[in-house]
Every structure is written in C-alpha cells, then in structure tokens.
C-alpha cells in the first residue's frame, strides 16, 4: 500500500486516528446492548471489558459478514506496561471481514508511524456478542503519545468501565462522563515497579482519571453523578454521599473537591459537566413513505429545549458494518420486507450519555411481474389471458387493454389466473398490460407484463349516406360512405342492381362510387350497396330508383 498524504499531514497508508477534541485519551469502553424489540430507546446493559493478561489491547472478533459487533474493545490494564508497537506490530489485513472501530486504545499509540505501514497493532481478543461503541468518540492514535495536560502521572492505575445503565421502566437513566489523565507533554510510561517506601500520592494525582456515571431521574429531571472509585471518598462541603453527588441540573457545571485519607493535598477538583436530559432526544424514523421499501432514514430529534451547547453534542450510528457520524442517516438499496437494526448513541463533550437501537422493517416492495402464459382471441368479440402470479406479496391485479387510443382497466382479484375479455371490437388489435399491486405505506405497482392479440373478423356494418342520381336518361351514379366498422382485413364495395327479381348488374369497386350505364328506360330498379371485408359481407343499403322515358 503506497503512502497517502493524510488530512492531518501524516504520510501513511492506514490513516492514523485524529481525536475529535482535546479531551484526554479514553481508557474504557462501553458495551452496546442488543435491541430485542421494535424500538428500544435509552435501554442499556452494563458490560465489563476484560483485557487479555498479556496485552493492553483486545479486538472483538467479527460477528458476521456485517461486522455488526466489530468494534475494538480496548483499554489499559492496571498492571501492564503499555505495549508500544514496532514495525513488527503492523496490522496485517484480515482475509475475512472488516473490523471497523470507533476508537482504538490509549496504549496503541505509535511514536513514529512508518509510511506504508499501519499505525495500530491488532491483537485478537475476546469475542463480544453485542455491538460495542467506545464511550469516547476519538481514535486516540497520534504521531506522538500524548497522555495528559494536567497531571504528571503515567497511565491510570485502574480502568473503569464507563457505562450507561438503565431500564426504560425505571426512574433512573444512566449517563456517563469521563475525566482521564493527561500528563503535561510527557510521553513517559510508568512501570509496575513498586517502591519499598511508597509515599502517599496527592489526591489530585490519585483521582486524576476518575470516571463518573450520570444517573438521570425522569421524574425529578435531575442527575446524580456516581463517582467511580473503590473507596468512600470525601467531598468538600459534604456534597457527596456514598460517592454520589445528587440533584445536579442538566447542562450546568458543578465543582466537587475529592479527598481521602490515602492521599494528600491538593485535593482533586472534579468539574462535572452535566449533560442534557436523556428524554429530550428521540430517535425518529424519517423515511419517506414512497421509498420505505428500499430505504431507511433515521434522525435524532430534539423534542425539548435545553441550555447545553449543541456544538458539544455529537451523534453516531452503526448499521451493519457502516458507521455514520451524522444526526441523520439515510440507507439505500435495502431489501423490501426485511428487518434492519441500527445502533446509535449521542455524546456530550465526547462522552456518551444516551443511546438507542432501532429495528426497522422495510415496507412491502413492488410486486414482481406476472408471467403471461397465453393471450389470444378466439372470437370476434372475445379474448382470453392467463398468467402465473408474481412471487412477492401483492393484493390485487390491474388488467388494462388498449385499442388504438382507448384504454380500459379492470381491477382483478389476487386469486385469479385467467380472465375472459368480452364485448371486444372485431378485427382489432388489443394491447394488454397486467400488473400486480400492493397497498402498503403507499400503493406500489409491480412491473407490467404485456401481450397483444387481434380479434377475429365479423360482418362489417352497413354502408351509409347512399345516394342514387340520374346522370342521363339511362345512366345512374351510385355513391355511399364507408361502414363505420369494417371488422375485417379487406375493403371492397359491391353494388347489385335488380329489375324486378332479376339481377341485371353486379359490380365491385375499391371505392363506393359506381356509374351504371345502359339501363332500360322507364324501369324501376333496386340498388343494393354493401361492404365486404374479405371475410364477411355487410348488410346492404337498398334504394329504389326509376329510369325515365327517353327524352329523344
């Protein structure tokens, strides 16, 4: 893989991770609970990420081709010296599926990424059964190992799981914030060497990387901050009880001074940046009904106002192996009548405070095309069409038949596989179209199957506007207009002239324009004009006319 100039100025084929903010590096992960209902919002399960004893980094095995759970589950072991990768640690691409990840591990920073290599080492670890979103949105891989900006301590002595634990039926919802360690510009990693005469650390150092879980009370609309510490700490002004700070208002900062007899001054001053109320966000299905068979749209909606800076709120989605960092996502090319699950989370100041899983079933798709078996006319006024129904779900059929510019459509029962067309016009080409349709969120029409036939011939209708006029004493001029319905392939006009019961003339022309000469004077004649279409003669139009006495 050739080196590629990265957006951050690095030259590497595997783009190093760039933190989304200047927040300290994460040392914990939060497991995402699987959705088991159509829509479960703010419903989470607490999961502890156990690290492999020999490595500071573990990686979730791919769950399926979709990699629905393929996030790196990473953290820093409390007794391990972080492993800084060398060239030998370059990631070998898996021959199998992707493991897309929101974040890597603090220990996985590479001091000098080599162009053309990868900036993270992948160590197979435990397999997680649920998709996991790391709590912090950053992938903390930078060209230098930056730890903290306000402490000289090395990596944290303990890695807490930062989770949001809730049951939607409970009054409490759990949100989380993390304060992690970041020594000032130093890339020194401490080892596990234990001094023989350890001095007490300062409380500021000891609790430098303290993590906090925010529990939200839906009734009081207040938060409780739970301090994730092993011992019962003391807070200045007695603001905490049993390591909990109560009655915190959303979107307000609170300062807590933390001390304990195991550490010395200065105390740890913890700023609690309280997130917005969880119920102020709703994951909304924004799919257009017309496209709901093959697309999904999901959008986080702010259903109530709050005073937190919306710039500090970030959104994430994962659907299968696709990750999004938008408030709204649209997926296309989906299968109709199929269930899809998307996991989403909202972060405040880069710390997750709520999440939701949504299972959406795409709408019924357009039915397939019926298969026409035959389509023919066996009579002048009738036709028949038979078909096999499409495979996909449908409600009914629409059969349309078009002659010239005239179109008639019929709604047919879904169980029909044959239809007899009646009252058709003889010797007429009919184009038939048959499609199935389904009434879903909207009516969706399937592709139409087409066929055509020409009805059989029938006797033509009568000629009309027939006239007989005398052109001379013994000559007549007979004219008529064509029949309204020819009903056959050919066009021929016939004229029969009778005197009494005797046929005296029988002529046939392409046009209805006959000049009859040399008739007897002063004789009554019967003129019969009719149309013949090649198969059938029409009804004759009959007129009587007499010749006059010869004028000479």
């Amino acid at each position: 893989q050739s080196p590629t100039p990265s957006p951050t100025g690095l030259t590497t084929a595997k783009m190093p991770s760039v933190p989304l903010s200047s927040d300290p590096l994460p040392t914990h992960t939060t497991a995402f609970s699987p959705a088991s209902t159509f829509e479960r919002e703010n419903d989470f399960s607490e999961t502890t990420t156990s690290l492999s004893p020999d490595n500071t980094s573990t990686q979730v095995s791919p769950d399926s081709l979709d990699n629905a759970s393929a996030f790196n589950t990473t953290g820093v072991s409390s007794v391990q010296t972080p492993h800084l990768p060398t060239h030998a640690d370059s990631q070998t691409p898996s021959a199998g599926t992707d493991t897309q990840t929101f974040s890597g591990s603090a220990a996985n920073a590479k001091l000098n990424p080599t162009p053309g290599s990868n900036a993270i080492s992948d160590v197979p670890g435990e397999r997680s059964t649920a998709s996991t979103f790391p709590t912090d949105p950053v992938s903390p891989l930078t060209t230098t190992l930056s730890l903290a900006h306000h402490s000289s301590a090395a990596l944290p002595a303990r890695t807490s799981n930062t989770t949001i634990t809730a049951n939607t039926s409970d009054a409490y919802l759990n949100a989380s914030e993390t304060t992690t360690l970041s020594p000032s510009g130093s890339a020194v990693i401490s080892t596990t060497t234990i001094a023989t005469t350890p001095s007490k650390p300062t409380c500021d150092e000891k609790y430098a990387n303290i993590t906090v879980d925010y529990l939200y009370n839906k009734e009081t609309k207040l938060f409780t901050a739970k301090l994730n510490v092993n011992e019962n700490v003391e807070c200045g002004n007695n603001t905490c009880t049993n390591n909990e700070v109560h009655n915190l208002t959303e979107c307000k900062n609170a300062s807590v001074s933390i001390s304990h007899n195991s550490c010395t001054a200065p105390d740890k001053t913890l700023i609690l940046d309280v997130p917005p109320g969880v119920e102020k966000f709703q994951l909304h299905d924004c799919t257009q009904v017309e496209k709901a068979d093959t697309t999904i749209c999901l959008k986080w909606k702010n259903i109530e106002t709050f005073t937190c800076d919306t710039q500090n709120i970030t959104y994430r989605f994962q659907c299968g192996n696709m990750i999004f960092d938008n408030k709204e996502i649209k997926l296309e090319n989906l299968e109709p009548e199929h269930e899809y699950k998307c996991d989403s989370e909202i972060l405040y100041n880069n710390h997750k405070f709520t999440n939701a899983s949504k299972i959406i079933k795409t709408d019924f798709g357009s039915p397939g095309e019926p298969q026409i078996i035959f389509c023919r006319s066996e009579a002048a006024h009738q036709g028949v069409i038979t078909w096999n129904p499409p495979q996909r779900s449908f409600h009914n059929f629409t059969l349309c038949y078009i002659k010239e510019t005239e179109k008639d459509c019929l709604n047919l029962d879904k169980n029909l596989i044959k239809y007899d067309l009646q009252n058709l016009k003889p010797y007429t080409k009919y184009v038939l179209s048959l499609h199935a349709y389904i009434i879903a969120k909207v009516q969706r029409n399937g592709s139409a199957a087409m066929c055509h036939f020409t009805t059989k011939s029938a006797p033509p209708s009568q000629v009309w506007n027939m006239t007989v006029s005398m052109t001379s004493d013994n000559s007549m001029h007979v004219k008529c207009r064509p029949p309204r319905d020819r009903n056959g392939p050919h066009e021929r006009y016939h004229l029969e002239v009778e005197a009494g019961n005797t046929l005296v003339r029988n002529e046939s022309h392409k046009n209805c324009d006959f000049r009859v000469k040399d008739l007897q004077y002063s004789t009554d004649y019967t003129f019969k004009a009719y149309f013949h279409n090649g198969d059938y003669p029409g009804e004759p139009f009959i007129l009587h006319h007499s010749t006059s006495y010869n004028s000479k």
């Epitope: 783009m15 991770s17 021959a95 992707d98 990840t101 192996n321 997926l331 199929h338």
Partner: nanobody, 124 residues
C-alpha cells in the same frame, strides 16, 4: 498487503460526468465496507459515499447530502472494483477523491486503508 488504486479522475466541465474506479487487492473485497472520501484544497476530508452490508443485505449505500442524486457508488465483487459515477458535476466537487477500505471517518481512521487518490477538477 491491502492495495487500493484509483483511476478515472480528470478535468471536466460543469454539468459533465466522470466515473472513478478503484482496483482493490490484498483483502476480501466482497465482505468489506468501502467508501469514497474527497478532500478539497484547504478543507477537511468529506465522505461522499459508502457501500456496505446491513442485516444480511450487501450493496447498501449512503451518500452525503451534497452529492445525493448526482453520485452513484457501485461495486463489482467479481473484479474487486469499486466505482463512483459522478453526474451533473459542479465546481465545488473539485477535490482529490480517495478510495477507502473502511468507513472513511475521522473516528474510524485507525482501521481504514486509503488509496493514493485521484484528482477531479470541475472547471469551465
């Protein structure tokens, strides 16, 4: 070794079309989520399109609002090739276009592989 090689970039007039291709090797292409990411001069990277799989359905796509209805991402698993059909091009589409194995986001960069990019310039 993962290799991604883009082609098909060039100079085109506004309203014109281009088809970018990305030849992939060194990994199982059909199982992988793939993206097109562009970077205009002086701007951050923007993922314009992604193709992946969700719930057993492969070939699922998504587009940035800025290109929706104009760009189409497709993949040819038999040839391990990713395509981006770009129609109705605008001057603001001018950028280097990268083929990415992965999601092509800041947050996923650690596990993404990027090609070297192909320049697309839309100008009259």
């Amino acid at each position: 070794e993962v290799q991604l090689e883009e082609s098909g970039g060039g100079l085109v007039q506004p309203g014109g079309s281009l088809r970018l291709s990305c030849a992939a090797s060194g990994f199982t292409f059909s199982n992988s989520v793939m993206s097109w990411v562009r970077q205009a001069p002086g701007k951050g990277p923007e993922r314009v399109s992604i193709i992946g799989s969700v719930g057993g359905t492969s070939g699922v796509t998504s587009y940035a609002d800025s290109v929706k209805g104009r760009f189409t991402i497709t993949r040819d698993n038999a040839r391990s090739t990713l395509h981006l059909q770009m129609n109705s091009l605008k001057p603001e589409d001018t950028a280097v276009y990268y083929c990415v194995k992965g999601n092509g986001l800041t947050s996923t960069r650690a596990s993404d592989y990027w090609g070297q990019g192909t320049q697309v310039t839309v100008s009259s």
